[in-house]
C-alpha cells in the first residue's frame, strides 16, 4: 500500500528511573503534509506529550532534525522518567487543515513501563520492650519501586526466618508500589546483642540487595535474678549482707533495702558490670548493726528495674545466733507498686 | 490467557432487580477498566459506562443514569451490573467489555469481551 | 457523538472486496474501533485508532479514514467473515457505536 503508515517497532519499552526513555516512530511517506504528535493514552482521556508544530515540551527532545527535508523518523526521548510516565504512547499523524489539522493515522502503541528502585527499607520494632519466651513483631517497609515484583527475607542473626507475613500494594498495576512485611520473632536471654535484617531483592538493584536492620536490644527486657548473703562477719555486732542483682537488661535499676520491712536504703545502680552477653550484673550490700537489734531481722533486697514491678528477695539474718553467720532467705515479688522509674 | 466470564441468563418481572457478575482471570484485575455495553434483541451496541477497577469509581452514560449501578468485588476479580425496577426495555444482553490501556486511562476500545448475559423481563 | 453505518445490510461473495462505511456526527479524529460480530456471539475487535489492524486480526481487514469518515475494507471475503460489522468512536463520551452492518452472501 502506498498510503502513510506510522510504524512504533517496539510494542513495549522499559526504563529505570531516573533515565530517559526513547520512544521510535516512523513514517513510510512524506504525504500527506502535517504535523505529528505524541500522546499517552488514547481517546478522551489521552495526554499530549509532544506536538511537532508548536508548544514547550521541555523534557522531551527529538531523535533526529524533524525540520529536515525528507525526515520520516519522528522518534522522540523523555528525559529524567519516573514511575508516573508509565503507560501507552501513540505516534500520531496529522494532516494540515484549515483552520485546524486533521488526525491521520496512528502508530500501533508502545508501552512504558518504569523500572523504579525500591526506598532504603526502614525496619520497626514494638513500642514496648517484651521479657525472654515471648513473641514480638518487627515490620519492615519500602515505597515507590516499579515493577511489582520484589523478594523480601528476614534475618536473625543470619539466619533467615519463616514466620512472616508480606503485602505488596496496590494489588493492581500501579505507577509504583510499596511492601510491608511483619516479622514474629520468639525473644531469648541472650538477644541483648541479636540483630534482625530485612533484605529486599528487585530487579533494579542488579543483585545487591537493600538491607533494613533493627537491634533487639531495643525490644527485650531481661529481669534480674536476685541473689541475697551474708558475708563473714567484719566486727561482732556487725552483720554484712549483699544483694547480687545479675543479668539484667536493660541498665535502669532501682534498688531498696528494708529491714523488716522499714525502708532502710535506697540506691541507683551506678556501677555496673556488663556481661559478654550484653546483660549487667550489681552487688550492693548493707550492713547491719546486730547490737541495735534484740530479735531476728529480715533483711529484703527490693530491686525495681526498667519501670516494672519490683521484684525482691529477703533474707532473715538470726540476730541470737549472728556469730555463727547464717541466716535464711525468702524471695517473693513485691505486691507493692514500683517506685516512679529514674 | 485472559478470559471474562459472565453469569447466566436471567428470567425477571417487571419491577425486579437483576445483578449480573464478569468474573476477570488472566491479568491483574485492577489494572483495567471495565465497561458495560447493552445489546437489545436484534439491535447495535450501547455503551452504558465504566467502572474503574482500581478505585471503584464509575461513571454512567446519560441514557442509564438512575436505575442503573457498577460494583466491584475486588478480591474475586468480579464486576457486577445492577439494575433496578426492571421494564421491558431492559430486556437484552449485557456484555462486559475491558479496556486496553492502564494505568487508569478512560476507556477507548474493547479487545476483551465477556460472553454476554442475556436478562429477559416479561410479566 | 452519532455514528452512522447506512448501509444495515451490504450482499457479497467469497473472494470479494467489500467496503463497510461509518460516519461520525462531528470530527473524532482517528479515535475509531471496528468490530465484528457473529449471531449468539461477543464483539470482536478488528481495528483501533481507525487503521491498526489488532493482534492476530487476518491482514485482509483493513481501516481508513479520519475525521468524520471512515471504511472498514476486506481485502478478500471469506465465509467466516459473514457477520455483523459495528464501527465506535472513542473520542469523546459518551462511547458511542455504529448501529451495524451485516453482510450476507448473493
Known amino acids: 500500500e502506498d498510503e502513510l503508515q506510522v510504524i512504533q517497532p517496539e510494542k513495549s519499552v522499559s526504563v529505570a528511573a531516573g533515565e530517559s526513555a526513547t520512544l521510535r516512530c516512523a513514517m513510510t511517506s512524506l504525504i500527506p503534509v502535517g504535523p505529528i504528535m505524541w500522546f499517552r493514552g488514547a481517546g478522551a482521556g489521552r495526554e499530549l506529550i509532544y506536538n511537532q508544530k508548536e508548544g514547550h515540551f521541555p523534557r522531551v527532545t527529538t531523535v533526529s532534525e524533524l525540520t529536515k527535508r525528507n525526515n520520516l523518523d519522528f522518534s522522540i526521548s523523555i528525559s529524567n522518567i519516573t514511575p508516573a510516565d508509565a503507560g501507552t504512547y501513540y505516534c500520531v499523524k496529522f494532516r494540515k487543515g484549515s483552520p485546524d489539522d486533521v488526525e491521520f493515522k496512528s502508530g500501533a502503541g508502545t508501552e512504558l513501563s518504569v523500572r523504579a528502585k525500591p526506598s532504603a527499607p526502614v525496619v520497626s520494632g514494638p513500642a514496648v520492650r517484651a521479657t525472654p519466651e515471648h513473641t514480638v513483631s518487627f515490620t519492615c517497609e519500602s515505597h515507590g519501586f516499579s515493577p511489582r515484583d520484589i523478594t523480601l527475607k528476614w534475618f536473625k542473626n543470619g539466619n533467615e526466618l519463616s514466620d512472616f507475613q508480606t503485602n505488596v500494594d496496590p494489588a493492581g498495576d500501579s505507577v509504583s508500589y510499596s511492601i510491608h512485611s511483619t516479622a514474629r520473632v520468639v525473644l531469648t536471654r541472650g538477644d541483648v546483642h541479636s540483630q534482625v535484617i530485612c533484605e529486599i531483592a528487585h530487579i533494579t538493584l542488579q543483585g545487591d540487595p537493600l538491607r533494613g536492620t533493627a537491634n533487639l536490644s531495643e525490644a527485650i527486657r531481661v529481669p534480674p535474678t536476685l541473689e541475697v548473703t551474708q558475708q563473714p562477719m567484719r566486727a561482732e555486732n556487725q552483720a554484712n549482707v549483699t544483694c547480687q542483682v545479675s543479668n539484667f537488661y536493660p541498665r535502669g535499676l532501682q534498688l531498696t533495702w528494708l529491714e523488716n520491712g522499714n525502708v532502710s536504703r535506697t540506691e541507683t545502680a551506678s556501677t555496673l558490670i556488663e556481661n559478654k552477653d550484653g546483660t549487667y550484673n550489681w552487688m550492693s550490700w548493707l550492713l547491719v548493726n546486730t547490737c541495735a537489734h534484740r530479735d531476728d531481722v529480715v533483711l529484703t533486697c527490693q530491686v525495681e528495674h526498667d519501670g516494672q514491678q519490683a521484684v525482691s528477695k529477703s533474707y532473715a539474718l538470726e540476730i541470737s545466733a549472728h556469730q555463727k553467720e547464717h541466716g535464711s532467705d525468702i524471695t517473693h515479688e513485691a505486691a507493692l507498686a514500683p517506685t516512679a522509674p529514674l | 490467557q485472559i478470559q471474562l466470564v459472565q453469569s447466566g441468563p436471567e428470567l425477571k418481572k417487571p419491577g425486579e432487580t437483576v445483578k449480573i457478575s464478569c468474573r476477570a482471570s488472566?491479568?491483574?484485575?485492577?489494572?483495567?477498566?471495565m465497561s458495560w455495553v447493552k445489546q437489545a434483541p436484534g439491535k447495535g451496541l450501547r455503551w452504558m459506562g465504566w467502572?474503574?477497577?482500581?478505585?471503584?469509581?464509575?461513571t454512567c452514560a446519560d441514557d442509564f443514569k438512575g436505575r442503573f449501578a457498577f460494583s466491584l468485588e475486588t478480591s474475586a476479580t468480579t464486576a457486577y451490573l445492577q439494575i433496578h425496577n426492571l421494564t421491558n426495555e431492559d430486556t437484552a444482553t449485557y456484555f462486559c467489555a475491558r479496556d486496553p490501556h492502564s494505568y487508569g486511562n478512560s476507556p477507548a476500545w474493547f479487545p476483551y469481551w465477556g460472553q454476554g448475559t442475556l436478562v429477559t423481563v416479561s410479566a | 457523538i452519532v455514528m452512522t453505518q447506512s448501509q444495515k445490510f451490504m450482499s457479497t461473495t467469497i473472494r470479494d472486496r467489500v467496503s463497510i462505511t461509518c460516519k461520525a456526527s462531528q470530527n473524532v479524529g482517528i479515535s475509531v474501533a471496528w468490530y465484528q460480530q457473529k449471531s449468539g456471539q461477543s464483539p470482536k475487535l478488528l481495528i483501533y485508532s481507525a487503521s491498526n489492524r489488532y493482534t492476530g486480526v487476518p491482514d485482509r481487514f483493513t481501516g481508513s479514514g479520519s475525521g468524520t469518515d471512515f471504511t472498514l475494507t476486506i481485502s478478500n471475503m471469506q465465509s467466516e467473515d459473514l457477520a455483523d460489522y459495528f464501527c465506535?468512536?472513542?473520542?469523546?463520551?459518551?462511547?458511542?457505536f455504529g448501529s451495524g452492518t451485516k453482510l450476507a452472501i448473493k
Open positions: 465506535q468512536q472513542y473520542s469523546s463520551y459518551p462511547l458511542t
Open positions: 488472566g491479568y491483574t484485575f485492577t489494572t483495567y477498566g
Open positions: 467502572i474503574n477497577t482500581y478505585s471503584g469509581v464509575s
